[in-house]
């Protein structure tokens, strides 16, 4: 390596206000826990002739680090050890040979809070940019997954529900998806940022909750969304007290309820009363019941909360890392209410059994 042991021209911080050495970076960046952020950064360093052919090494250090003793949090120097707690999560994404010191942080953790400074080394030219420093603020994860239900749900007919975290970023560790549902389910395909649950609803699944929980294990943070399955009974021109389905699987509108009830107003009224009663009981029961499913690898126990009105403690934990890209500012989730999904029952009597067993399905 050329002039490897030449006396450094500039000592770290010795010329903090040196106009020949400058760095441009935002002084503060905010990232939600478990998510990621890319901080643009450029710097300039004058180089004497004897270092012009030397490789440029860049380093990001925590504020207060002693260069000779402490490892950086990120560097492009391959044989350089980095801090264990930031390894693989902090990356010097920019190319220092092109004066780019951009820093990428994925799977942001609470303990990443703090200030960081950049240092360049090129042969015997070495300089720590003590100003400006980058201040990283890690805030609560406010993003929540979205659950997509294509059309209406029909009893006995399978539907693909998709839980997605489109706000997660590609660079992070893919999250763990966990589904919690009383209805018969199986797992469909998953992508980096979405999971498909195949649900085959039954009449008794009316009023039950379906939860998609997403764990960003890289940061030990969990977020979830719960929707409530709203079951609507749709008779098919009844002739007896039992309404078998025709097997066509065709979707009917809510208007079908009215048409089917004209020939038997008494039956319809009674049925409506039963449904309302069942719905009320299930809803009340659901609010009181604590749904708890215990998972393994509870290395970072966190409590994911449903909406403020329907808080149900959940301890679903599984090892995964994050992959979310929040920008510098957190996004506020607008919808904090429970969502209602409609299950249309064609020609089936609602079950009188209101007790519900929940099953948990996980995808990693």
């Amino acid at each position: 390596m050329p002039l490897l042991l030449l006396l450094p021209l500039l000592w770290a911080g010795a010329l903090a206000m040196d106009p020949n050495f400058w760095l441009q970076v935002q002084e503060s960046v905010t990232v939600q826990e478990g998510l990621c952020v890319l901080v643009p950064c450029t710097f300039f360093h004058p180089i004497p002739y004897y270092d012009k052919n030397s490789p440029v090494h860049g380093y990001w250090f925590r504020e207060g680090a002693i260069i000779s003793r402490d490892s950086p949090v990120a560097t492009n120097k391959l044989d350089q050890e980095v801090q264990e707690e930031t390894q693989g999560r902090f990356r010097l994404l920019g190319d220092p040979s092109r004066n780019n010191c951009s820093l990428s942080i994925v799977d942001a953790r609470r303990r990443d809070n703090g200030s960081y400074f950049f240092r360049m080394e090129r042969g015997s030219t070495k300089y720590s940019y003590k100003s400006p420093q980058l201040s990283v603020h890690v805030t609560d994860l406010t993003h929540r997954p979205k659950i997509l239900i294509p059309g209406t749900l029909e009893p006995g007919h399978s539907k693909n529900l998709t839980c997605s975290v489109s706000w997660a970023c590609e660079q992070g560790t893919p999250p763990i998806f966990s589904w919690l549902s009383a209805a018969p389910t199986s797992l469909g395909p998953r992508t980096t940022h979405s999971s498909v649950l195949i649900i085959t609803p039954r009449p008794q699944d009316h009023g039950t909750n379906l939860t998609c929980q997403v764990k960003f294990a890289g940061a030990g943070v969990t977020t979830e969304r719960t929707i409530q399955l709203n079951v609507t009974y749709v008779p098919q021109n009844p002739t007896t007290g039992i309404f078998p389905g025709d097997g066509s699987g065709k979707q009917e509108t809510r208007a079908g309820v009215v048409h089917g009830a004209i020939g038997g107003a008494g039956v319809t009224a009674l049925l409506a009363l039963c449904l309302c009663l069942i719905f009320f009981i299930v809803k009340t029961h659901r609010r009181k019941a604590a749904r708890t499913a215990v998972g393994r690898n509870d290395t970072h126990p966190t409590t994911g909360s449903a909406s403020p009105k329907h808080q149900k403690k959940s301890k679903l934990h599984g090892p995964t890392e994050t992959s979310s890209c929040s920008g510098a500012a957190p996004t506020v989730e607008m919808d904090e209410e429970l969502h209602y999904a409609s299950l249309n029952f064609h020609g089936m009597n609602p079950s009188k059994d209101t007790s519900t067993e929940y099953s948990e399905v996980r995808t990693q």
Partner: antibody, heavy 116, light 107 residues
Framework: QVQLVQSGGDLAQPGRSLRLSCAAS????????MHWVRQAPGKGLEWVAV????????YYGDSVKGRFTVSRDNPKNTLYLQMNSLRAEDTAIYYC?????????WGQGTLVTVSS | DIQLTQSPSSLSAYVGGRVTITCQAS??????LNWFQQKPGKAPKLLIS???NLEPGVPSRFSGSGSGTDFTFTITNLQPEDIATYYC?????????FGGGTKVEIK
Amino acid sequence: QVQLVQSGGDLAQPGRSLRLSCAASGFTFDDYAMHWVRQAPGKGLEWVAVIWPDGGQKYYGDSVKGRFTVSRDNPKNTLYLQMNSLRAEDTAIYYCVRHFNAWDYWGQGTLVTVSS
Amino acid sequence: DIQLTQSPSSLSAYVGGRVTITCQASQGISQFLNWFQQKPGKAPKLLISDASNLEPGVPSRFSGSGSGTDFTFTITNLQPEDIATYYCQQYDDLPLTFGGGTKVEIK
């Protein structure tokens, strides 16, 4: 203490060759880049050549490029300047210089006279 | 090549007086400039590196400043032993180049 002792200066005819030596002592020779600088009588300083600590990179001033060769023998702690195709304008005192951040140590200089 | 224009080429000053020498580079050289002192019959001696850093053992009456293309070398409280020729030299890029020199004499 650091010393750079030069030798090899002489009178040479145009077109002939000379080899200058610079023996280093008092420091770890292979840690340092080394330069040759010259000064024609009554004139200013002119940079001639540089060689990297490991000998891997060498650079020359325009006026000597292709005629002079700088080399070093690290085990012997010695720097060389091979001067071929000498010209009258190469007449000067030649200095070897140690590079440590800046040019902190110079040899005593050796006179090369090119004349017919 | 980077040219260094040094001025004046010679000057005369009183003992205890102040001497200022300028060195202008043909292009920006950041702070990569040395100042040397050469006394008759001797090898040059480095006084200032990096445009303004005084070398160890050099009296504090010598100073340097500047960055980019314009540099200044100053001797305050001129002493008889300061009679010499002073050179600036850039090491921003190869080939390394020197200014033409400034000869300082005592009045």
